[in-house]
């Protein structure tokens, strides 16, 4: 179990959750492993049990408090260890000094809704979830629209380089079904990555009026 290639990656959602993934080629599926969190300036220690998510990877969430509580700051350091049981003892398999605001991955945007729809355009809004007030306006978004006959992977990415929780989609086809997704990323952090994509929002453009184009 020790000799396979291993990887340990964790992200902070900016509020009260650190999510970790541990992968190791050749590890037994029933190996018992956990993540232990030891902060440098907090009174708590936290542990979560790594549960299998695929053949060679395990995941768990360190829940630090209420979802919207600000449990860590930019000066915190949390030492994270992967511990796996070997017989009667626990062995350290991976270790890192984790700087939460260098390793951000926010929750997917929520509450997507159509504000206004016409024949060729649609205005959509959304909200960010469990995002720290520390960011102020230092966030960016990516959005994509699924057109009929295409896949999400083919959809061009629209980049919003500021904290703008709405978009006006243009040059749409009348009377056509579309789907829309958005994701968010803070500008801060060397290892920060995009949030998951939001749940898709389905909408339909209005049919063109007979005899004229609106």
């Amino acid at each position: 179990a020790v000799n396979g290639t291993s990887q340990f990656t964790c992200f902070y959602n900016s509020r009260a959750n650190i999510s970790c993934v541990w992968s190791q080629d050749g590890a037994l599926q029933d190996t018992s492993c956990q993540v232990h969190a030891w902060p440098d300036r907090r009174r708590w220690n936290q542990t979560c049990e790594l549960l299998p998510v695929s053949q060679a990877s395990w995941a768990c969430n360190l829940i630090l408090g209420a979802p919207d509580s600000q449990k860590l700051t930019t000066v915190d350091i949390v030492t994270l260890r992967v511990l796996c049981r070997e017989g009667v003892r626990w062995r350290v398999m991976a270790i890192q000094d984790f700087k939460p605001f260098e390793n951000l991955r926010l929750m997917a945007p929520i509450s997507l809704q159509v504000v206004h729809v016409e024949t060729h355009r649609c205005n959509i809004s959304w909200e960010i979830s469990q995002a720290s007030h520390y960011f102020e306006r230092h966030l960016e978004f990516e959005a994509r629209t699924l057109s009929p006959g295409h896949t999400w992977e083919e959809a061009p990415l629209l980049t919003l380089k500021q904290k703008q929780e709405w978009i006006c989609l243009e040059t749409l086809t009348p009377d056509t079904q579309y789907e829309f997704q958005v994701r968010v990323k803070p500008l801060q952090g060397e290892f920060t990555t995009w949030s998951p994509w939001s749940q898709p929002l389905a909408f339909r453009t209005k049919p063109a009026a007979l005899g004229k184009d609106t």
């Epitope: 020790v2 440098d40 350091i77 398999m93 991976a94 270790i95 890192q96 000094d97 700087k99």
Partner: nanobody
Framework: QVQLVESGGGSVQPGGSLRLSCAAS????????MSWVRQAPGKGLEWVAS????????DYADSVKGRFTISRDNAEDTLYLQMNSLKPEDTAVYYC???????????????????RGQGTQVTVSS
């Protein structure tokens, strides 16, 4: 670009001490785990010690445990190796090495290094 420059090597008698330094530049030093490795004449690279980004976790090869201490000064972007009770078998070129992330893996400490310096020679003999 990433640069690692070792210094502090030299000749010393058995039982003596040396302190190696490694000046790092070209990356955010505190965001990365670091290590020392060495290469004795005619031998392959041997892992010596590793340290997490803020020094809260350290690991040592059995051959140096209790004699060597790895540490770092993130304000100065410098990695250190304090070597005490030196033995002839510690003779080697010592390299400072950067891991590719903030994580290192104690069971396979040689894995995941992406840069190392030019090295500094340590000779232990009477």
């Amino acid at each position: 670009q990433v640069q690692l420059v070792e210094s502090g090597g030299g000749s010393v008698q058995p039982g003596g001490s040396l302190r190696l330094s490694c000046a790092a530049s070209g990356f955010t030093f505190s965001n990365y785990a670091m290590s020392w490795v060495r290469q004795a004449p005619g031998k392959g690279l041997e892992w010596v010690a590793s340290i997490t980004g803020f020094g809260r976790g350290t690991d040592y090869a059995d051959s140096v445990k209790g004699r060597f201490t790895i540490s770092r000064d993130n304000a100065e972007d410098t990695l250190y190796l304090q070597m005490n009770s030196l033995k002839p078998e510690d003779t080697a070129v010592y390299y400072c090495a950067k891991y590719s992330s903030s994580t290192y893996y104690p069971p396979t400490p040689a894995r995941g290094r992406d840069y190392r310096g030019q090295g500094t020679q340590v000779t232990v003999s009477s």
